[in-house]
């Protein structure tokens, strides 16, 4: 695992704890509520950040419209069991035993259940829309350079191959940036669209994971990009089961 | 050359509250986890939990949770578990070891809980 | 929690002959898996660290290997003084658990 060596430290997640007694002696940084160990050359797992974070000491229009299966993330933080991967687990349950079927990025997809609800597998979020809104600026960004800028910062900080990055679409004030990945396409060692857009999410709330560096200073042309409100739509690989009850 | 040397043996009333030590030299006592370990006679090792000198943060067996508490002092390279309400189930060795790969042990300190 | 079952529960051997130890994995521990000896009335030894990195001070003699679920570890004619109890423990994530030992005796 490439841990900065020299003084031990993941470059990439500032939620972990790291040793000098990792094989071969190297650097082993473990994310801090399940000690597993992390590639610090890359994102961490979304769910292995999630568990981290609830062990946390108590210290015309160009615009998508997201689909009716799209899901927002309403349910908020919940400590996930993750796989030996660091994957969630495609089925969640709670302390008092409720239970609930997820896809890749955690995000709830079926009706709470008991413990005899059946998740058969881990649906892929193929698909990923966040919705974006800036705070006011003397006039509109140039598109071009806000989708290059925007394209950059998914390239370079968070390390998802440009392909992934199907979209920028602009209308002032709204800016949504789409994600795309298939199973198919995602190959060993790329980076997950869902962890991507969880440190984006992070960083565009000022709470960055990364370690040491300061905070997300976004700008276009040397105009800052502040971001006022953030919505972000998950679609599944398979629409998601609710119920009717839910949908009125 | 690394040493953990740990308190020696206990004998507590049950219920009476007990703290063992375990005293770290030949290393940055900091930059290594430290656990601790259970063995009763005749029996297994059971993982009781680890602390990270710098930081503190700790973690716990669910099962020593709620009466195990580890502590360090970093300015004597010393880590205690504290052990509250013990019972006879609780009268063991106690060992603290170093690292992930458990590489050094302590000596081990003998608790006897008993009336 | 991940659970480690060891296999056999003891080993009745001659001095000379060639032993492996089996160390299973309730789940995926990648190489995060280490070896341990306890003789009687003394503290656990480190014999393997990671599945296969040998231990400076340990003997040649012992060697290990596996990844993912299925471990070993092996003594290449063992000798009077290795005699004793064996336990895996795996550090892949919390709570760290141990197996339940394999005791090396004499036939």
């Known amino acids: 695992h490439t841990a900065a060596q020299d003084n031990c430290t993941c470059p990439t997640n500032k939620m972990t704890v790291c040793s000098p007694d990792g094989p071969g002696g190297r650097c082993q940084c473990r994310a801090l509520g399940s000690g597993m160990a992390v590639d610090c050359s890359t994102l961490t797992s979304k769910c292995l950040l999630l568990k981290a974070r609830m062990s946390a000491p108590k210290n015309a229009r160009t615009l998508v419209r997201p689909s009716e299966h799209a899901l927002v993330d309403n349910d908020g933080l919940y400590d996930p069991d993750c796989d030996p991967e660091g994957r969630f687990k495609a089925r969640q349950c709670n302390q008092t035993s409720v239970c609930w079927c997820v896809n890749s990025v955690g995000v709830r997809r079926t009706d709470k259940g008991d413990l005899s609800l059946r998740c058969d597998e881990l649906v892929r979020t193929h698909h990923i829309l966040i919705d974006l809104r800036h705070r006011p600026t003397a006039g509109a960004f140039n598109h071009s350079d806000l989708d290059a800028e925007l394209r950059r910062l998914f390239r370079e900080r968070y390390r998802l191959h440009p392909k992934f990055v199907a979209a920028v679409h602009y209308e002032q004030p709204t800016i949504q940036i789409e994600l795309r990945q298939n199973t198919s396409q995602k190959a060993a060692g790329d980076v997950d669209i869902g962890d991507a857009a969880y440190y984006f999410e992070r960083d565009i709330k000022g709470e960055s994971l990364f370690q040491g560096r300061g905070g997300l200073d976004l700008r276009v042309r040397g105009e800052p990009l502040q971001v006022e409100r953030t919505l972000i739509y998950y679609l599944d690989e398979i629409p998601p089961k609710f119920s009717m009850k839910r949908l009125t | 050359q690394v040493q953990l040397q740990q308190s020696g043996a206990e004998l507590v009333r049950p219920g009476a509250s007990v703290k063992l030590s375990c005293k770290a030299s030949?290393?940055?006592?900091?930059?290594?986890?430290i656990n601790w370990v259970k063995q009763r006679p005749g029996q297994g090792l059971e993982w009781i939990g680890n602390?990270?000198?710098?930081?503190?943060?700790?973690n716990y067996n669910q099962k020593f949770k709620d009466r195990a508490t580890l502590t360090v002092d970093k300015s004597s390279s010393t880590a205690f578990m504290q052990l509250s309400s013990p019972t006879s189930e609780d009268s063991a060795i106690y060992f603290c070891?170093?690292?992930?790969?458990?590489?050094?042990w302590g000596q081990g300190t003998t608790l006897t809980v008993s009336s | 929690d991940i659970v480690l079952t060891q296999s056999p529960a003891t080993l009745s051997v001659t001095p000379g002959d060639s032993v492996s130890l089996s160390c299973r994995a309730s789940?995926?521990?990648?190489?995060?898996l280490h070896w341990y000896q306890q003789k009687s009335h003394e503290s656990p030894r480190l014999l393997i660290k990671?599945?296969?990195q040998s231990i400076s001070g340990i003997p040649s003699r012992f060697s290990g290997s596996g990844s993912g679920t299925d471990f070993t570890l092996s003594i290449n004619s063992v000798e009077t003084e290795d005699f004793g109890m064996y336990f895996c423990?795996?550090?892949?994530?919390?709570?760290?658990?141990f197996g339940s030992g394999t005791k090396l005796e004499i036939k």
């Open positions: 070891t170093r690292g992930s790969g458990f590489d050094y």
């Open positions: 030949g290393y940055t006592f900091t930059s290594y986890w």
């Open positions: 602390i990270f000198p710098s930081g503190s943060y700790t």
């Open positions: 789940q995926s521990i990648s190489n995060n």
């Open positions: 990671y599945a296969s």
């Open positions: 423990q795996q550090s892949n994530s919390w709570p760290f658990t």
